[in-house]
């Protein structure tokens, strides 16, 4: 791989804490790091056919890190798509012109030097501009394991035209059964987008109990269709030695 400049071309970023080195000393090694993480927050890119896509992973490190790209977890070569692609090492970016539906997938930048490696994944969907079913960002909501009494936040990132209806559901049991007579799972509606529902893409659970463990579903629909993704919540009790000692003498039960 060609070596990109270690300067953040994208920004006047002066947040580096590295000290200037004199000519006769080697610079301190620095593992790769993102120089503009706020510019990487948009992970789901839903793009009409024929447009250009630019993904950026502005980074730095000492020595200069290398940059490479994967598609769906595999090495991504220019001959893997019609028209190839361009990697702009100076701006830590990959550019794909004239996208087509076969370009859909997950694109991962890997930035590495001998002291470390970092990566970031973008999700590309190639869409019709005309109304389409909702698209959900991969990996969200994410599985969570939390301690009893904690607060939990599940997030669901939605791209939809027209306006979507968002529901948060929890799989439950009724009379010991998870499946109803209609062969559909029993669910409880926890939240839905509406007049009284601010930030419908986020579900917050406060002071969770063990009974709240289970599968949570983000279900999004519009008049064209629907999409849903789920995550598991595991609520754990503190380890035995962490529990406060209540009894001061042994108690025997006959």
């Amino acid at each position: 791989d060609a070596l990109p400049s270690s300067e953040d071309d994208d920004d006047d970023d002066d947040s580096s804490s590295e000290e200037k080195e004199t000519d006769n000393t080697k610079p301190n090694p620095v593992a790769p790091y993102w120089t503009s993480p706020e510019k990487m927050e948009k992970k789901l890119h839903a793009v009409p056919a024929a447009k250009t896509v630019k993904f950026k992973c502005p980074s730095s490190g000492t020595p200069n890190p290398t940059l490479r790209w994967l598609k769906n977890g595999k090495e991504f070569k220019p001959d893997h798509r019609i028209g190839g692609y361009k990697v702009r090492y100076a701006t830590w970016s990959i550019i794909m012109d004239s996208v087509v539906p076969s370009d859909k997938g997950n694109y991962t930048c890997i930035v590495e030097n001998e002291y470390g490696s970092i990566n970031h994944t973008y999700q590309l969907d190639v869409v019709e501009r005309s109304p389409h079913r909702p698209i959900l960002q991969a990996g969200l909501p994410a599985n969570k394991t939390v301690a009893l009494g904690s607060n939990v936040e599940f997030m669901c990132k939605v791209y939809s035209d027209p306006q979507p209806h968002i529901q948060w559901l929890k799989h439950i049991e009724v009379n010991g059964s998870k499946i109803g007579p209609d062969n559909l799972p029993y669910v409880q509606i926890l939240k839905h987008s509406g007049i009284n529902s601010s930030d419908a893409e986020v579900l917050t659970l406060f002071n969770v109990t063990e009974a709240q463990s289970g599968e949570y579903v983000c279900k999004v629909s519009n008049y064209i269709g629907e999409a849903n993704q789920s995550a598991w919540l595991t609520v754990t009790r503190p380890a035995l030695e962490e529990r406060p000692a209540v009894m001061t003498s042994p108690l025997y039960l006959e």
Epitope: D9, D10, D11, K39, H45, V47, P48, A49, A50, K51, T52, K54, K56, K86, R88, T91, I95, D97, S98, V100, E128, R129, S130
Partner: antibody
Framework: QVQLQESGPGLVKPSGTLSLTCAVS?????????WSWVRQPPGKGLEWIGE???????SYNPSLKSRVTISVDKSKNQFSLKLSSVTAADTAVYYC?????????WGQGTLVTVSS | SYVLTQPPSVSVAPGQTARITCGGN??????VHWYQQKPGQAPVLVVY???DRPSGIPERFSGSNSGNTATLTISRVEAGDEADYYC???????????FGGGTKLTVLG
Amino acid sequence: QVQLQESGPGLVKPSGTLSLTCAVSGGSISSNNWWSWVRQPPGKGLEWIGEIYHSGSTSYNPSLKSRVTISVDKSKNQFSLKLSSVTAADTAVYYCARGTDWYDLWGQGTLVTVSS
Amino acid sequence: SYVLTQPPSVSVAPGQTARITCGGNNIGSESVHWYQQKPGQAPVLVVYDDSDRPSGIPERFSGSNSGNTATLTISRVEAGDEADYYCQVWDSTSDHRVFGGGTKLTVLG
């Protein structure tokens, strides 16, 4: 090579509808491109009006959206612009163009004057 | 909607370097394209995808894009470069194309 040619009346009355057609020759309108209309009032800059894909999918400039319709006729290898309720402010040179993210091909442009 | 800001005019002597800027919020995340338009003619693409040149465009034309500013650089300016120059992006957030207001390049002398 591919060429674009605009056609339509050069004079439209106020409150009337401006109608233009762009003929695509030397290539197919069903290629992976967006077919656009761009206008330029006398002495002013370029203004994107809207665009259409061969599937019929469209996107319009929000400031003109309520008055604009762009359609495609694959059988004739052409696309059209209709702009309703025109006023003198719509007087401009109207260009058709072929684009992906950028425009690599333009028609020569046609001047449309809105006047009674 | 997304706004692209260009200086109305830039003047340069023949043989010098002209730089025309295009400002936009985090424009470095978009792909920027540049057009040259001479009086009475349709625009001509001179740079696309920030810094690529279509065939037939002299190497004197180059582009860069980072942060909040994209720049078209014309080195060794010639009298024939006198024209209006427009930047353009497809704004991925609004799904609309946007043009800058245009910059008139005057070649002095």
